[in-house]
C-alpha cells in the first residue's frame, strides 16, 4: 500500500516513515499489514487466499497377476514402461470413474511379482470451508473401489478375461497426503503482532482475514461518526469533533452538543 | 510405427480348414505378446487365442483342439491355423499385438491392431 506525497514536506516524511515501510523518492513503500501517509495505520482485511484447489495424494501398492515381470518395465523410458502405463492409466480411470475428486494415477515403480506396482491416485477437490471431509470421503471411495476392482478382476485358470487382472493381497494403501490449508493459521501469521485481533470470517465460502476495524462482517465495530483504529492493544474508536459536537464513549456514540458545555450545560445523546 | 496386416480369410465350407496370417512391421518380435480375435456380425470382439514371446499359449475354449496359434519371432509373423470350421466361427478376425508379456484374452490390453480377414463358414 502506498500513499505519494508532494511539496517540500517530503524529505521530512521520508525519515518518518513508520513499521517498516521504505522511502522510494516519492512515497513511503508500506509492508503489507500497514498503509497510510508514513505506514502508520494497520490494515483492516489481510489476503490469505485461498487456493482455487486442494490436493492429496495416497500412495497405494497393487499387484498386477495378468502381465509378467520383464527388466524392460524397471525403464520408464521404455516402450513397454510407456504401454503398461497406459493400460495401467486407462483401466484406474474405469475404477476411479465414479469420484469427481480423481484426477489421475502416477507410477512411481514397477517390481517384481508379478508385477507389482506402487503408484500414486492424485484427487483434488474445490476449496470449501469442508475440503477435508469432502477429500476424506472420497480417500475411502479410491478404497473401497480398488479393493472391488482386485477383489472381483481375478486370474481363472491362468487367463485373465479383464484389461489387468490384480492378486486380492497384493492391495495396500502406505499414506495418505491432504494439502494443508488452515486460513485461522494463516490469518494470525500474517497479522503478526496484530494476531489475536484478526478473525476468520467466510463469505460465499471464502475465508476473510479481518479485524474488527473492517465494515460488514459479524465481528465488525461500530465506531458511529468515529474511525476504527487498531493498536497493540486492540481495536479502537477515534472519535471526531464535528463543529456542533464533540463525540466520546467507547464506540463514540455519546454526542456532546458544543454550544451546552460553553454554555456550562452538559447534555448526552 | 507397429503395423500389423492379416491375410488369408475367405470363404470356406464347414468343417473345412484356413490359415491365417499376421505379418508385423516395427514390432520387436522377440518380445510382448500376439494375439488373434474375433468379431461376428452384431456381437462383441473376443479372444481367440494368444501367444507369449517365450511360445506360451492360450486358447478360448470354444476353439481349443480345432485352433493352432504360432508365432515366428524371425519373420515377424503370427499364423492361426484353424480346423474342423463351424458356422459359428463366421467373423473378422484380427491379428492383435502388445509389448507385454500379457496373459489376458481382453482386447483392452492390446495396444496394436491390424484392420482384420474375414472368414466365412458356410455350405
Known amino acids: 500500500r502506498t500513499t505519494t506525497c508532494f511539496g517540500d514536506g517530503c524529505q521530512n516524511t521520508a525519515s518518518r516513515c513508520k513499521n517498516g515501510g521504505t522511502w522510494d523518492g516519492l512515497k513511503c513503500q508500506c509492508p503489507n499489514l500497514y498503509y497510510g501517509e508514513l505506514c502508520e495505520e494497520v490494515v483492516s482485511s489481510i489476503d490469505i487466499g485461498p487456493p482455487e484447489t486442494i490436493s492429496a495424494q495416497m500412495e497405494l501398492t497393487v499387484t498386477v497377476t495378468s502381465v509378467k515381470f520383464t527388466e524392460e518395465l524397471k525403464n520408464h523410458s521404455s516402450q513397454e514402461f510407456q504401454e503398461f502405463k497406459q493400460t495401467f492409466t486407462e483401466q484406474m480411470n474405469i475404477v476411479y470413474s465414479g469420484i469427481p475428486e480423481y484426477v489421475g494415477v502416477n507410477i512411481t515403480k514397477l517390481r517384481l511379482g508379478s508385477v507389482v506396482v506402487e503408484h500414486d491416485v492424485l484427487l483434488r477437490t474445490k476449496y470449501t470451508p469442508e475440503y477435508k471431509t469432502v477429500l476424506d470421503n472420497a480417500t475411502e471411495v479410491v478404497k473401497e473401489k480398488i479393493t472391488k476392482v482386485t477383489t472381483q478382476q481375478i486370474m481363472i485358470n491362468d487367463i485373465c478375461s479383464d484389461m489387468m487382472c490384480f492378486n486380492t493381497t497384493g492391495t495396500q494403501v502406505q499414506n495418505i497426503t491432504v494439502t494443508q490449508y488452515d486460513p485461522e493459521e494463516d490469518c494470525r501469521k500474517m497479522a503478526k503482532e496484530y494476531g489475536d485481533y484478526f478473525v476468520v470470517e467466510y463469505r460465499d465460502q471464502k475465508p476473510y482475514c479481518i479485524s474488527p476495524c473492517e465494515p460488514g462482517f459479524s465481528v465488525s465495530k461500530n465506531c458511529n461518526l468515529g474511525k476504527c483504529q487498531m493498536s497493540l492493544s486492540g481495536p479502537q474508536c477515534l472519535c471526531v469533533t464535528t463543529e456542533t459536537h464533540w463525540y466520546s464513549g467507547e464506540t463514540c456514540n455519546q454526542g456532546t452538543q458544543k454550544s451546552l458545555v460553553y454554555g456550562h450545560h452538559h447534555h448526552h445523546h | 510405427d507397429v503395423q500389423l496386416v492379416e491375410s488369408g480369410g475367405g470363404l470356406v465350407q464347414p468343417g473345412g480348414s484356413l490359415r491365417l496370417s499376421c505379418a508385423a512391421s516395427g514390432f520387436p518380435s522377440s518380445r510382448g505378446t500376439m494375439a488373434w480375435f474375433r468379431q461376428a456380425p452384431g456381437k462383441e470382439r473376443e479372444g481367440v487365442a494368444f501367444?507369449?514371446?517365450?511360445?506360451?499359449?492360450s486358447y478360448a475354449e470354444s476353439v481349443k483342439g480345432r485352433f493352432t496359434i504360432s508365432r515366428d519371432n524371425a519373420l515377424s509373423s503370427l499364423w492361426l491355423q484353424m480346423n474342423s470350421l463351424r458356422a459359428e466361427d463366421t467373423a473378422v478376425y484380427y491379428c492383435?499385438?502388445?509389448?507385454?508379456?500379457?496373459?489376458?484374452?481382453?482386447?483392452?490390453?492390446?495396444?496394436?491392431w491390424g484392420q482384420g480377414t474375414m472368414v466365412t463358414v458356410s455350405s
Open positions: 492383435a499385438a502388445s509389448l507385454l508379456y500379457l496373459m489376458t484374452v481382453n482386447a483392452a490390453a492390446y495396444p496394436y
Open positions: 501367444i507369449n514371446s517365450d511360445g506360451r499359449t
